[in-house]
Structure formats: structure tokens, C-alpha cells
């Protein structure tokens, strides 16, 4: 899978994680930090 960094306009899209662009799927994706989940890594779980 080819990935690259998200466009600058997506800065802040992922609240607790890194935004990556999945080129082959044409999708922005939030790779969440440990302890976080949700489309935008907005939910904390224990």
C-alpha cells in the first residue's frame, strides 16, 4: 500500500494521532496514538 503525508489542510484532523494518505484507497486515515480510537482518534479508552 502506497502512503504519504496528508495535505496541509488536514493538519489537526487527527486529534490524537498521525494523518496519513492511503494513495491506493484515496483515503485519509488517522493512525491513533495508544489509548485513542475513533475516525479522528477523538475517543480515549482505558
Amino acid at each position: 500500500v502506497s502512503i504519504t503525508k496528508c495535505n496541509s489542510d488536514m493538519n489537526g484532523y487527527c486529534l490524537h494521532g498521525q494523518c496519513i494518505y492511503l494513495v491506493d484507497m484515496s483515503q485519509n486515515y488517522c493512525r491513533c496514538e495508544v489509548g485513542y480510537t475513533g475516525v479522528r482518534c477523538e475517543h480515549f479508552y482505558l
Epitope: 495535505n7 496541509s8 489542510d9 486529534l15 494513495v23 484515496s26 485519509n28 475516525v39 479522528r40
Partner: antibody, heavy 116, light 106 residues
Framework: QDQLVQSGAEVKKPGASVKVSCKAS????????IQWVRQAPGQGLEWMGR????????KYREKFEGRVTITADTSTNTAYMELSSLRSEDTAVYYC?????????WGQGTLVTVSS | DIQMTQSPSSLSASVGDRVTITCKAS??????IAWYQQKPGQAPRLLIQ???TLQPGVPSRFSGSGSGTDYTFTISSLQPEDIATYYC????????FGGGTKVEIK
């Protein structure tokens, strides 16, 4: 099926304000950004600004700063664009556009006519 | 704001011709450019995103290329149904549309 349904056509007097709504279904606007784009009759497409409904953060095109306000009500899954001090040049079709995980998905457009 | 200079503003070509439209950004947009087709009275239709990624259902005669500040949109063999106005859109930093290219049949 994802949808963005915009409010109906409006006719306004110069100097008045207009508020256009954009109701989302099939997805949560908190997972997206909502952009607003307009197109005057016979003219090109013009980006106006956008909102992050989760953080309630906005970005506006410089020429609209102070005259446009973009808001979102996450309880009703609806975004709004209000434009004040209307003039004849604001006569246009206004579109809301979803962006975020996937690329842009457009509403059907709302015609705003400014006429005395 | 990033400026997008699209050219030509209009063109006339014959059915079967190769048609090329260019967009030049005022700064590097890192391949974050999309191309839209718009027919009179209709909302814009997304054809291509991320420079060259064709949307599902879009004919393969449409293609895009480029990098840095210079981008190209090509219709390899113009068809009567391609008569429309085409817009580029940079979405790297905020958003800016090009001025549009009206494509007509000769």
C-alpha cells in the same frame, strides 16, 4: 447512503443577511470538515471557507473574512453558512462540500438571489 | 492564499482530438490537485483527485499528471459528451479553484 441536503432558494435585499443550511445523513459531520463553495451565474467556482465541526474551528477565504460565518450543530448533524451585508455580486449558487477521510462530496446547491 | 492559473480559458477541438488543460500553482501543492467537470445547470462532477487518481465510473480517456507547481489534465480522444467547463482545484493548503476551461466542439 451519504447525503448533504441544503435549504431552499432565497431572495434577499441588498444589505440583508442569508443563512444556508446543509443537513448531513448517512455519516457524522464530526468525522469530517464541511467546506462552502459558491458559483455566481456564468462564473467560476470560489471557495469561501470551512468548519471542523468536532473542534468548531473555522477557516475563511480572506475576501470573506468578517462577512461570512460558518457554524455547525452536531446535535442535528447540520452545518450553516451565513453571509451578511449582501450585495448583487453575492447572487450565486452556494454549495456545501464534505471532506475528510474521503475526498469531496457535494450538496445539491442553494440559489441565493440578491435583488432590490 | 495559493493562486491557481488555469489555461486556456476556452478551447475548440474536433471529436477524437487530444485536449490538454494546464494549471500552475503559485507554490508547491504536493500533488494535491483535483479536476472537475461541470455541465450547464449541474453541480461539478469530480473526475480526478491527487493528480492522477481517476474516480470510479470516469472513462479512461481522462487523465492527469504533474508535480510541484505544474499540472496537466488530458482528454485523449474528445467525445461530444465531454463538452463542459473543467476546473482544477488545489487542496493542499485551504482550497483554490482555477478559473476554468470551456471546452467546445469545432
Amino acid at each position: 447512503q451519504d447525503q448533504l441536503v441544503q435549504s431552499g432558494a432565497e431572495v434577499k435585499k441588498p444589505g440583508a443577511s442569508v443563512k444556508v443550511s446543509c443537513k448531513a445523513s448517512g455519516f457524522n459531520i464530526k468525522d469530517t470538515y464541511i467546506q462552502w463553495v459558491r458559483q455566481a451565474p456564468g462564473q467560476g467556482l470560489e471557495w469561501m471557507g470551512r468548519i471542523d465541526p468536532l473542534r468548531h474551528q473555522t477557516k475563511y477565504r480572506e475576501k470573506f473574512e468578517g462577512r461570512v460565518t460558518i457554524t455547525a450543530d452536531t446535535s442535528t448533524n447540520t452545518a450553516y453558512m451565513e453571509l451578511s451585508s449582501l450585495r448583487s455580486e453575492d447572487t450565486a449558487v452556494y454549495y456545501c462540500v464534505r471532506s475528510g477521510r474521503e475526498f469531496d462530496f457535494w450538496g445539491q446547491g442553494t440559489l441565493v438571489t440578491v435583488s432590490s | 492564499d495559493i493562486q491557481m492559473t488555469q489555461s486556456p480559458s476556452s478551447l475548440s477541438a474536433s471529436v477524437g482530438d487530444r485536449v490538454t488543460i494546464t494549471c500552475k500553482a503559485s507554490q508547491d501543492i504536493h500533488k494535491y490537485i483535483a479536476w472537475y467537470q461541470q455541465k450547464p445547470g449541474q453541480a461539478p462532477r469530480l473526475l480526478i483527485q491527487y493528480t492522477s487518481t481517476l474516480q470510479p465510473g470516469v472513462p479512461s480517456r481522462f487523465s492527469g499528471s504533474g508535480s510541484g507547481t505544474d499540472y496537466t489534465f488530458t482528454i485523449s480522444s474528445l467525445q461530444p459528451e465531454d463538452i463542459a467547463t473543467y476546473y482544477c482545484l488545489q487542496y493542499d493548503n485551504r482550497r483554490t479553484f482555477g478559473g476554468g476551461t470551456k471546452v467546445e466542439i469545432k
